[in-house]
Structure formats: structure tokens, C-alpha cells
Interface confidence: medium
């Protein structure tokens, strides 16, 4: 009875582990659309994965209601500043819900990174990290937006990313 009980416990633990939704999405060459839409993400290659969450056009889609820790980091950088750039850059995580017609702000940060360029070096770097626990219902979606996305540096999938896991 002992070994069978242990086996059952192991199966139970594994089952509960498997259904705990989690995802980590990484920046890719296709992330920046230039269309004003949310950033797009790699879902399979390298460090990226989806488990118990789905993905659609930049959005993580919740299949199981609960409390989720959601997070995103974007690497910002440039040579000087693009003309017409807003004085602040907004990086945000936004919720889409069938119950409301517009995206809802969940976590937002604002930077003024272009001030980091100096007369001796026009190259500058900055980053923005957002993370927090929110309640999400099944069918709700979370997206990342950056205004101005021209400043997001992608490269190898480790600098800019987006993820969530149920807590």
C-alpha cells in the first residue's frame, strides 16, 4: 500500500504541476510591427515556451482563471533620438477582456531615455521591467505595448521578453 500511495502522490503532484499555466515569450525580428499594434513574440524557439496558456497576435490568452504574475522587460537603446520622438517612452502591460471594449492598463512605466545621449556619445541604453500579480479570467488576454517601439532592441531573445505564470 505504501509504494502505491507514494506513486499516486507523485502522479498527483505531477498533474498539478503540469496544469499550472506558465509562459515565457522572447523578442524576435518580427516583434516590431511598426503598425502601432502590440509587440509580437517568439513562442517556441530558444528560451520561449507556452504551457497552459495560448498565444494570438502578440497576446497571451488565459485558459484558466486565477491570479497570475505577469511580467515584461524591454531593452531600449539607440543612437541619438528619432525626430518626433515623444519626450517619454511608455512600456505597458494591458488586458483585453470581452467585457470591455478597450484595453485596460495593468502595469505601465514611463522613461525619458534619450536624455542619456551626450555630446561625446550619442549612443544610449536603458531598460524597463514590469511585473505584478493580477487576476485574469479565462478568455482574457494580456499584451505588451511600447511607444516608441523604434527604441526596442531585440537581438537574441534575452533582452526583451514577456511572460506569465499562475500563482
Amino acid at each position: 500500500d505504501g509504494p502505491a500511495g507514494s506513486w499516486e502522490q507523485l502522479i498527483q503532484e505531477r498533474r498539478s504541476h503540469e496544469v499550472n499555466p506558465a509562459a515565457h515569450l522572447t523578442g524576435a525580428n518580427s516583434s516590431l510591427t511598426g503598425s502601432g499594434g502590440p509587440l509580437l513574440w517568439e513562442t517556441q524557439l530558444g528560451l520561449a515556451f507556452l504551457r497552459g496558456l495560448s498565444y494570438h497576435d502578440g497576446a497571451l490568452v488565459v485558459t484558466k482563471a486565477g491570479y497570475y504574475y505577469i511580467y515584461s522587460k524591454v531593452q531600449l537603446g539607440g543612437v541619438g533620438c528619432p525626430l518626433g520622438l515623444a519626450s517619454t517612452i511608455t512600456h505597458g502591460l494591458y488586458k483585453r477582456t470581452p467585457r470591455y471594449p478597450e484595453e485596460l492598463e495593468l502595469l505601465v512605466s514611463q522613461q525619458s531615455p534619450c536624455g542619456r545621449a551626450t555630446s561625446s556619445s550619442r549612443v544610449w541604453w536603458d531598460s524597463s521591467f514590469l511585473g505584478g500579480v493580477v487576476h485574469l479570467e479565462a478568455g482574457e488576454e494580456v499584451v505588451v505595448r511600447v511607444l516608441d517601439e523604434r527604441l526596442v532592441r531585440l537581438r537574441d531573445g534575452t533582452r526583451s521578453y514577456f511572460g506569465a505564470f499562475m500563482v
Epitope: 539607440g78 543612437v79 541619438g80 533620438c81 525626430l83 550619442r122 523604434r150
Partner: antibody, heavy 121, light 111 residues
Amino acid sequence: QVQLVQSGAEVKKPGASVKVSCKASGYTFTSYNVHWVRQAPGQGLEWIGAVYPGNGDTSYNQKFKGRATLTADKSTSTVYMELSSLRSEDTAVYYCARGSYYYTSSYFDHWGQGTLVTVSS
Amino acid sequence: DIVMTQSPDSLAVSLGERATINCKASQSVDFDGDSYMNWYQQKPGQPPKLLIYTASNLESGVPDRFSGSGSGTDFTLTISSLQAEDVAVYYCQQSYEDPFTFGQGTKVEIK
């Protein structure tokens, strides 16, 4: 399709000013910079400056700062380049060009047909 | 200002042969793995036309016989098989910092 249509040729006397227009169509006017580049007869290309029609921000080549003024009229999707205190060496074809971005790097993907400005006494 | 120097000033190549134009910047125009260098073609009486942006990206609608390469300060525009319609002046341009500057141009002719 994207089009930039410039005003016609001008002949000006030294010391005068000239205002060249560039009417944009086929894209969201307020989303792209418009640059101005000139080319003296038989010579190469020289960047004058740029304007962002979304908010009127400008950037100038120091060589032209104080003499060149770039403006944008959102209501007509038109950008203007005014050059004052003209001298004979300002005789050139003046081009407007749309600036597109690859990250923070700007390149000129559509050009106007050019406007010949002749400065002669 | 960043000075752009092209070589040669003119080039005569047989139809179907390879044409190579070089451009040297007075300082590096690289940032984060990208080279802020663009190439344009200008035919007589016409405005310049974008061929290559960010050193190696082919502009939409440009024939794939055109290619760009290089990094840092040294860049190359290659026409793999010269066609009659490729007779023009070619300019490199840096967009690393303003004032954006152009090379003096390279005239390509048919031998």
C-alpha cells in the same frame, strides 16, 4: 501609393528668400519625417534638415541653421522648406524625401521630383 | 561631421559582369550589430532611389542583383550582373548621426 509632389522651379535674386513646398499623399502624413536634401548642378547630395509633421519637431544641418526653416501643415499634408539670404551657391535642385526608420536609423525611401532653385542677379 | 568617401569615382563594367562600389566612413556607423549605412541610385534628371538600407537590407521592389555588405567604417555595394538600366550614379549615406552625409557618388557606365 506614396507620392511627394514638389512646387515648380524658382528664380531668385541674391539676398532673397525662397519657399519650396512638398505635398505628401498615400501614407499617414503625421507618422513619418520629411527630409530635405539638395544637389548643386553636377554635384553630390547634401542634407539640409528634417521635420516631423506629427508635432512640428525639426532637426537641421548646422550649415543651414538660421537660414533654413522647415514647417509642416497637417491640414494639407504639405511640408515647406524656406531658405533665406540666398547666394549663388544655393543654386541647386531641392528634394523632399520621406524618412523611414529601421530602429533609430533613418533612410529616405520616397523622394519628390525635385525643385530647381536658381539664384542669379 | 562623418565624412563618406566612395571609390572609385567612376566605373566601367561589361553587361552581365559584376560591379563593386566601396564606401568608407570617417568613423564607425555601427550600433548594436546594425550598420547605419544606406545606398541610393540616381539616374540623370531623376531623384535618388533607395536600394539598400542598414548596410544589407534590400528595399522592396529592388532587384536582387543589388546587395550591400560591410560594417564599421567599410561598406560595399555590389551589382552581381550589370544590366543596361543600372547605368547611374550611386551614393552611400550614413544615418548614424546628423547631419546625415553622403558620399561624393560613383558613376557606373557600360564598358
